[in-house]
């Protein structure tokens, strides 16, 4: 026997209190698949998060980060502070890359300059806090 709830489309829930009719999701909630017995609460993009896509009756809201921050984690579950190129984020805030390391992005950690001699090459352009060395013949 077919479950009557399977006829309820996305954007609705199967209302057990009303003879399993399909009822529309309440405001600020959604159902992205058919046959659901409840709707899901919409994600709210507050604080350092901002709304990239509004919640609809059939899809959740999507967040990104306010300027000066970048997304981390699946679905932008966290926002992390940006640093300048040539810096990395530590527990004490943004710190300049140590000598011999660089970071060419606003996120991530400082990485060691390439060791040209490992490939039998010499340094063509010196490295900086923001740029890796350029190896030459």
């Amino acid at each position: 026997l077919q479950d009557p709830c399977s006829n309820c489309p996305a954007g609705t829930f199967c209302d057990n209190n009303r003879n399993q009719i399909c009822s529309p999701c309440p405001p600020n909630s959604f159902s992205s698949a058919g046959g659901q017995r409840t709707c899901d609460i919409c994600r709210q993009c507050k604080g350092v998060f901002r709304t990239r896509k509004e919640c609809s009756s059939t899809s959740n809201a999507e967040c990104d980060c306010t300027p000066g921050f970048h997304c981390l984690g699946a679905g932008c579950s966290m926002c992390e502070q940006d640093c300048k190129q040539g810096q990395e984020l530590t527990k004490k805030g943004c710190k300049d890359c140590c000598f011999g390391t660089f970071n060419d992005q606003k996120r991530g950690i400082c990485r060691p300059w390439t060791n040209c001699s490992l490939d039998g090459k010499s340094v063509l352009v010196n490295g900086t806090k923001e740029r890796d060395v350029v190896c030459g013949p």
């Epitope: 829930f13 209302d15 209190n17 309440p26 405001p27 909630s29 017995r37 409840t38 899901d40």
Partner: nanobody, 122 residues
Framework: EVQLLESGGGLVQPGGSLRLSCAAS????????VGWVRQAPGKGLEWVSA????????YYAESVKGRFTISRDNAKNTLYLQMSSLRAEDTAVYYC???????????????RGQGTQVTVSS
């Protein structure tokens, strides 16, 4: 026991106004998410308006924005829907609804009243 009693419906000409009332008992309207749902003849339920986040925000369906206003009287534990510039397509049974948040994270709503009929016709 949660009870919702709607009133204020009737027959009105296009362009006219009505104010619906919903007297609640068994819960406090100021502490919950509440609103209005309607069902037009031969159609499914449609959310019209709601007061959410304990009054922090309001919701209106696109079709009623600028024409309908939701409000509540905490002392009377009553929810209202002021409807103006009414159109034939607003003809429906209007129900007071309480949004229900389930422990598992799901959301549904309760309709406990019989609704009030609004007919817009010349």
């Amino acid at each position: 026991e949660v009870q919702l009693l709607e009133s204020g419906g009737g027959l009105v000409q296009p362009g006219g106004s009505l104010r619906l009332s919903c007297a609640a008992s068994g819960f406090t309207v100021s502490a919950e998410d509440v609103g209005w749902v309607r069902q037009a003849p031969g159609k499914g339920l449609e959310w019209v308006s709601a007061i959410l986040d304990s009054g922090g925000s309001t919701y209106y369906a696109e079709s009623v924005k600028g024409r309908f206003t939701i409000s509540r009287d905490n002392a009377k534990n009553t929810l209202y829907l002021q409807m103006s510039s009414l159109r034939a397509e607003d003809t429906a049974v209007y129900y007071c609804a309480r949004v229900v948040y389930h422990s598992g994270g799901g959301v549904t709503f309760d309709l406990r009243g019989q609704g009030t009929q609004v007919t817009v016709s010349s």
